[in-house]
Interface confidence: medium
């Protein structure tokens, strides 16, 4: 008996009704007394709805299903599912039995549109070009998980410092929060597009920021364009220079280093002398080079908390300023690998392999591979926890069904240092214990 269902998944919005189409071709003389129709969940075989012994046996699925009884005799075995929920997503099998029988499965893909994103800005006062701001884009109650894209006012993607989190509520609907950290230009539009990949629905919000112009003086202050990368515990030099005019003396110089965002004083040279460090006594100027225009700052025993933007203000008669970014980094340790369970392993067993790497910064990227380099993207959960110093310990867990034998390797990448640390575990086909006994 040929049973026909749509090839493509049926897409249904949360809260609406969905029709799972199923049909068969009744032969001449067919009567409903001959029909056995069963709808069930494909994976669990849970009964959803049935029609047997010439009558509708009703819904076995939360009283939310119904058949098209007036159309059954014409071969329409479709199922109506009311008030669709996220939990309904999956495959439903339609079994039809008259003399012969046949079956076919239809997929239900649940979807819910995302709300128009709301945009927030932090800080949102007294903004100047060069300030680092955090823009948050929030969109609510969508399904499935969204794709989030950031763009500037010309449509160019902003892939820089973006962190996106998606949390499901009790109904399984996702709230998405995407945070963009960006250094302000003279002015700019920042837009966020939240895409529902199933509905191909885009929700977008944007924010236009027009910072106040900083008064710019005639002193040209030069700093490196790229961030200064410093390892935790080492010393870093934040370079800053100006061009002294002939006859310049240090008595004319006011030099101030401050944190760009908070304006906290870091170090200063005024009234012809070094006023010292206002920043945990870990900063120093190159006093013997100041007269030649070298206003660089030495930062000792760098910590994670030092990361950010430092502004160098130079005032002689006129003044100028420029900001330099400090990017802190720490290498990750060689990963340690653990296996659970670790005794009497056999092909077909499900095991949990944990890859742990410690005291790195910033957050790592973790990639899993098999022994031939194929990615293992399946059941991976990665968590990263910062300690008191702000350094991250990363734990990545892979759940996998063992084959006859196999190598599972984990690569922990420090994205700033471009440093890779990797560990691997090899599991052989015989019943075995891990680690192998001596």
């Amino acid at each position: 008996l040929e049973v026909q269902v749509p090839e493509d998944p049926v897409v249904a919005l949360v809260g609406t009704d969905a029709t799972l189409r199923c049909s068969f071709s009744p032969e001449p003389g067919f009567s409903l007394a001959q029909l056995n129709l069963i709808w069930q969940l494909t994976d669990t075989k849970q009964l959803v709805h049935s029609f047997t012994e010439g009558r509708d046996q009703g819904s076995a699925y939360a009283n939310r299903t119904a058949l098209f009884l007036d159309l059954l005799a014409q071969g329409n075995a479709s199922l109506r599912l009311q008030r669709v929920r996220v939990a309904d997503e999956g495959s439903f099998t339609c079994f039809v039995s008259i003399r012969d029988f046949g079956s076919a499965a239809v997929s239900l893909q649940v979807a819910a549109p995302y709300s128009k994103p709301s945009m927030t800005l932090e800080p949102n006062k007294d903004l100047r070009p060069g300030d680092t701001v955090t823009i948050t884009c929030s969109s609510y109650r969508g399904y499935p998980e969204a794709e989030v894209f950031w763009q500037d006012g010309q449509g160019a993607p902003l892939t820089g410092n973006v962190t996106t989190s998606q949390m499901a509520n009790e109904q399984g609907l996702f709230d998405v929060h995407s945070v963009l950290r960006v250094v302000l230009g003279a002015n700019g539009t920042y837009s966020c597009l939240v895409r529902n990949p199933v509905l191909q629905q885009d929700a977008h919000g944007s924010i236009t920021i027009t910072p106040q112009r900083s008064p710019t003086g005639a002193v040209e202050v030069q700093v490196p364009e790229d961030p200064v990368v410093a390892l935790v515990g080492t010393d870093a030099t934040l370079r800053c220079s100006f061009s002294p005019e002939p006859g310049f003396s240090l008595a004319q110089l006011n030099l101030i280093w401050q944190l760009t965002d908070t304006k906290q004083l870091v170090h200063s040279f005024t009234e012809g002398r070094d006023q010292g460090s206002a920043y945990a006594n870990r900063t120093a100027l190159f006093l013997d080079l100041l007269a030649q225009g070298n206003a660089s700052l030495r930062l000792q025993r760098v910590r994670v908390a030092d990361e950010g933007s430092f502004t160098c203000f130079v005032s002689i008669r006129d003044f100028g300023s420029a900001a330099v970014s400090l990017q802190v980094a720490a290498p990750y340790s060689k990963p340690s690998m653990t296996l659970e369970p670790n005794k009497d392993l056999r092909p077909g067993d499900t095991v949990t392999i944990t890859c742990s790497s410690y005291r790195g910064y910033p957050e790592a990227e973790v990639f899993w591979q098999d022994g031939q380099g194929a990615p293992l993207t399946g059941n991976v959960t990665t968590s990263q926890m910062a300690n008191e110093q702000g350094l991250f310990d990363v734990h990545s867990v892979l759940r996998v069904v063992l084959g006859a034998n196999g190598t599972y390797s984990c690569l922990v990448r420090n994205p700033v240092l471009q440093q890779d640390a990797h560990g691997s575990v090899t599991i052989t086909g015989q019943p075995m214990t891990f680690p192998p006994e001596a």
């Epitope: 990227e365 031939q372 990615p375 993207t377 006859a404 390797s409």
Partner: antibody, heavy 121, light 106 residues
Framework: EVQLVQSGAEVKKPGSSVKVSCKAS????????IHWVRQAPGQGLEWMGY????????DYAQKFQGRVTLTADKSTSTAYMELSSLRSEDTAVYYC??????????????WGQGTTVTVSS | DIQLTQSPSFLSASVGDRVTITCRAS?????MNWYQQKPGKAPKLLIY???NLASGVPSRFSGSGSGTEFTLTISSLQPEDFATYYC?????????FGQGTKLEIK
Amino acid sequence: EVQLVQSGAEVKKPGSSVKVSCKASGYSFTSYTIHWVRQAPGQGLEWMGYINPNSRNTDYAQKFQGRVTLTADKSTSTAYMELSSLRSEDTAVYYCARYSGSTPYWYFDVWGQGTTVTVSS
Amino acid sequence: DIQLTQSPSFLSASVGDRVTITCRASSSVSYMNWYQQKPGKAPKLLIYATSNLASGVPSRFSGSGSGTEFTLTISSLQPEDFATYYCQQWSSNPLTFGQGTKLEIK
């Protein structure tokens, strides 16, 4: 010398199947996966799938799922790619390639010379 | 799927020029490989794992990048370098190639 030698050019009718072979020599055939990559005239490279000759595990690109079958014969160190239900847009050069390296870095280091498959009525 | 987008798609340059080809990934990848292909020939490995030179490849070729942005640089073009270049990733299924960058003589 490590090499992959592929079978000769084929001309096929739409709806038929083609089977291309790739014979490996100069290395342990079961130690590396063999991938198949095709290139339509004037176009870029398109991955089709791979086979682990040791375990015979396969993985296929979604696009070719159900139409391509990859097999391997350990005794002759030969990998095969069979593509069914051929259509004119399957006209391409088909390459086999060894995915080599070691954990965690892998790459295609040896390629077959390519097999031209022409689908035409 | 992770899409790899190469830019530019076509590039005209002269012998001795310094040339940079960019490959952008739609999601973060662990590393990138680069291949060179000449007409009628199979591709040839140039750079593996983002920045490592394959055996026998001249040192004028170099690679760099991380995350979603990777570059292939030829420091001083030679006549034999005119070809098509492809980037490739397999951090996530399926394995994908960039659409290619054709390097032509100006």
